[in-house]
């Protein structure tokens, strides 16, 4: 079936704001009045794995950007990257898995964990200006948890 | 070789709890999910829910208040509970491994046990 | 949920025949289609997947076709081991669903 997607932003439980930080970097930070507009805008696709009762895989494409969340494994530690794509053949519905993430819903916030590296987040440092980054830890001091703002597309 | 083999009781009290086991040989549970299906006498085929390798389960609307899916990674074996049964839930129960082809099919179930006939009758 | 509607639900043919069965989605599923057949007694034996991908071992008179929302599935010379009920399933998006069936009875 055709790939169905919303256009969102993110923000951690500490409500810092995503951003691009450099061409294939996200950082978290605070942001306020017009500079919300620097916050990146998430086309996210629903797409097939292992989806249950509790987990959705989506898709974490940027919005009108060939760039997708994607992990992979560098120097033998799962990690965050954004990977650039065909803008012909993505979004799909049959997403590669190091491009899915298990979209968790838990007391009315999110967390994303990762599809090819199970227990590892989506997360931010408590620290403001810091990179986004996959974390194997829940419930420490980095920040595995987000809300979701729907925008319009 | 795959293979799967369903087993349980044949009879089942009405309102009592439905067990069966699926033991499996040939693939990993922790590589694959396995699904359940069920066929009343003569009709047709129902997919009832999966648990995937990491332990997930998705289970179909109309059962999930009544249905619970585990597994047993070391002795291969998936178990199915159904609680308060009901004559309609009289079947033929399948379990059956999933694909789990990432990026090209991911829920087709390819290898079926032969399936074990339950009687919901007092 | 997917409503899957396959027809028809029971058809007499003769050996050497040439058959056919639909089977149509109630929204886009892509390619993702499947067919089993099976016979009395027995589990389904998968036969086709991902819409016409034959799997290993199954003769090739056995077919699939269609994408999308619509989808066929044909016996192109029925032998006497063909007799049996198939059926659809989509594999789309949970839950999955399959068809009604189709009794492919001899003649």
């Known amino acids: 079936a055709p790939v169905r997607s919303l256009n969102c932003t993110l923000r951690d439980s500490q409500q810092k704001s995503l951003v691009m930080s450099g061409p294939y970097e996200l950082k978290a930070l605070h942001l306020q009045g017009q500079d919300m507009e620097q916050q990146v805008v998430f086309s996210m696709s629903f797409v097939q794995g292992e989806e249950s009762n509790d987990k959705i895989p989506v898709a974490l494409g940027l919005k009108e950007k060939n760039l997708y969340l994607s992990c992979v494994l560098k120097d033998d530690k799962p990690t965050l990257q954004l990977e650039s794509v065909d803008p012909k053949n993505y979004p799909k519905k049959k997403m590669e898995k190091r491009f899915v993430f298990n979209k968790i819903e838990i007391n009315n916030k999110l967390e994303f964990e990762s599809a090819q590296f199970p227990n590892w987040y989506i997360s931010t440092s408590q620290a403001e200006n810091m990179p986004v980054f996959l974390g194997g830890t829940k419930g420490g001091q980095d920040i595995t948890d987000f809300t979701m703002q729907f925008v319009s597309s | 070789e795959v293979q799967l083999q369903e087993s349980g009781p044949g009879l089942v009290k009405p309102s009592e709890t439905l067990s069966l086991t699926c033991t499996v040989s040939g693939f990993s549970l922790r590589d694959f999910g396995v699904s359940w299906i069920r066929q009343p006498p003569g009709k047709g085929l129902e997919w009832i829910g999966l648990i995937w390798g990491g332990g997930d389960t998705y289970y179909n609307s109309p059962l999930k208040s009544r249905l619970t899916i585990s597994k047993d990674n070391s002795k291969s074996q998936v178990s199915l509970k159904l609680s308060s049964v009901t004559a309609a839930d009289t079947a033929v129960y399948y379990c059956a491994k999933v694909r789990n082809l990432w990026g090209y099919d991911m829920y087709t179930m390819d290898y079926w046990g032969q399936g074990t006939l339950v009687t919901v009758s007092s | 949920d997917i409503q899957m509607t396959q027809s028809p639900s029971s058809l007499s043919a003769s050996v050497g025949d040439r058959v056919t069965i639909t089977c149509q989605a109630s929204?886009?599923?892509?390619?993702?289609m499947n067919w089993y057949q099976q016979k009395p007694g027995k589990a389904p034996k998968l036969l086709i997947s991902l819409g016409n991908i034959l799997r290993p071992g199954v003769p090739s008179r056995f077919s699939g076709s269609g994408s999308g929302t619509d989808f066929t599935f044909t016996i192109s010379s029925l032998q006497p081991e063909d007799f049996a009920t198939y059926y659809c399933l989509q594999s789309d998006s949970f839950p999955l669903t399959f068809g009604q069936g189709t009794k492919l009875e001899i003649k």
């Open positions: 929204q886009d599923i892509d390619m993702d």
